[in-house]
């Protein structure tokens, strides 16, 4: 069964996939595809790396982490409900039938509908509600959108919740590292 990951409409989705290169720069081809992993390669390829670089990608799909160190986790930008489904990460380890393949299920939830702010409009316009969470590579910024009035304590609480959520994901995903060599 697939490991399940969740994101909201309009957010960036993160699908983890890792391997440990045998030596620095000794990379292994990896493909990401929409749909479960087929018998060879990936179906409906959205991104592909070779021994040196990312050699194929499509819009909204990118590697946020350091793929040269084996972090080939996929980021899908600005997701919609249509992005829901199974994704395949295939690590094409050299040898006879050595591939490692992972099916990851992405569940997209509708964005939370919240009432527009009624007070402090100038504050809202001047300071968009953005929280930065720890990511794998460049920090990901998650926009909270039109929230009702909120105080600094609530912002701190939200930041902690986002951080803890990401940390939980990190801990859950830490067992999915493939060591090569």
């Amino acid at each position: 069964s697939e490991v399940e990951y969740r994101a909201e409409v309009g957010q960036n989705a993160y699908l983890p996939c890792f391997y440990t290169p045998a030596a620095p720069g000794n990379l292994v081809p990896v493909c990401w595809g929409k749909g479960a992993c087929p018998v060879f390669e990936c179906g409906n390829v959205v991104l592909r790396t070779d021994e040196r670089d990312v050699n194929y990608w499509t819009s909204r799909y990118w590697l946020n982490g350091d793929f040269r160190k084996g972090d080939v986790s996929l980021t899908i930008e600005n997701v919609t409900l249509a992005d829901s489904g199974i994704y395949c990460c295939r690590i094409q380890i050299p040898g006879i039938m050595n591939d490692e393949k992972f099916n990851l299920k992405l569940v997209i939830k509708p964005a939370k509908v919240t009432p527009a702010p009624t007070r402090q409009r100038d504050f809202t316009a001047a300071f968009p509600r953005m929280l930065t969470t720890r990511g794998h590579g460049p920090a990901e910024t998650q926009t909270l959108g039109s929230l009702p009035d909120i105080n600094l304590t609530q912002i701190s609480t939200l930041a902690n919740e986002l951080r803890d959520s990401r940390l939980a994901n990190d801990l859950r995903d830490s067992g999915a590292t493939i060591r090569i060599g």
């Epitope: 087929p38 018998v39 060879f40 179906g43 021994e51 380890i93």
Partner: antibody, heavy 117, light 107 residues
Framework: EVQLLESGGGLVQPGGSLRLSCAAS????????FSWVRQAPGKGLEWVSA????????YYADSVKGRFTISRDNSKNTLYLQMNSLRAEDTAVYYC??????????WGQGTLVTVSS | DIVMTQSPSSLSASVGDGVTITCQAS??????LNWYQQKPGKAPKLLIY???SLPIGVPSRFSGSGSGTDFTLTISSLQPEDFATYYC?????????FGQGTKLEIK
């Protein structure tokens, strides 16, 4: 023109060896996985072996594992199948086929391998 | 190995007829089902991939459907050049496996 052209088939005795070649033209050979698929006389299709675009990942059917070796030379746009310890049941037409988006979308014309004493 | 079972094994029909060939997988194959057409002495030709997608150049009278374990190939109005043997093939589990074939003959 996009095409695959097999060669190297023939009559060989049981226990003998043969090397098949598949020359590709008209497309970016190194970008694709390739397979060998065989068809015994009057029978259906049987997948034999596959190889990744860079040639470093290979795959074999149990029936040929340890006897057949698939390889490719991307500088020559050529796919190979080295067949050793041949048996009567290996008698078939051998096709090379390009694998694209989960289907074998381009096939050669086939080359006949007959294993008989 | 995933076993692919085609039915019928042979079929007689006339030009202009519509025909359906079925293929059943021994386990779910996530829609990774291809159909091929083969004429005597020739290589197979890909007709349908991923259960229902037509490669460029394949006439629209050919269509595929199905999911999970059960799939069908439909030819809406047979043409003289359609009389051939048809194979299904799964591309999900290792190794890739083919059905035993369905021979479509002129009635």
């Amino acid at each position: 023109e996009v095409q695959l052209l097999e060669s190297g088939g023939g009559l060989v005795q049981p226990g003998g060896s043969l090397r098949l070649s598949c020359a590709a033209s008209g497309f970016s050979f190194s970008s694709f996985y390739f397979s060998w698929v065989r068809q015994a006389p009057g029978k259906g299709l049987e997948w034999v072996s596959a190889i990744s675009g860079n040639g470093r990942s290979t795959y074999y059917a149990d029936s040929v594992k340890g006897r057949f070796t698939i390889s490719r030379d991307n500088s020559k746009n050529t796919l190979y199948l080295q067949m050793n310890s041949l048996r009567a049941e290996d008698t078939a037409v051998y096709y090379c086929a390009r694998y694209y988006n989960t289907g074998f979308d381009l096939w050669g014309q086939g080359t006949l391998v007959t294993v008989s004493s | 190995d995933i076993v692919m079972t085609q039915s019928p094994s042979s079929l007689s029909a006339s030009v202009g007829d519509g025909v359906t060939i079925t293929c059943q997988a021994s386990e779910a194959i996530y829609g990774y089902l291809n159909w091929y057409q083969q004429k005597p002495g020739k290589a197979p030709k890909l007709l349908i991939y991923a259960a229902s997608s037509l490669p460029i150049g394949v006439p629209s009278r050919f269509s595929g459907s199905g999911s999970g374990t059960d799939f069908t190939l439909t030819i809406s109005s047979l043409q003289p050049e359609d009389f051939a043997t048809y194979y299904c093939q799964q591309a999900y589990g290792f190794p890739p496996t083919f059905g035993q074939g369905t021979k479509l003959e002129i009635k």
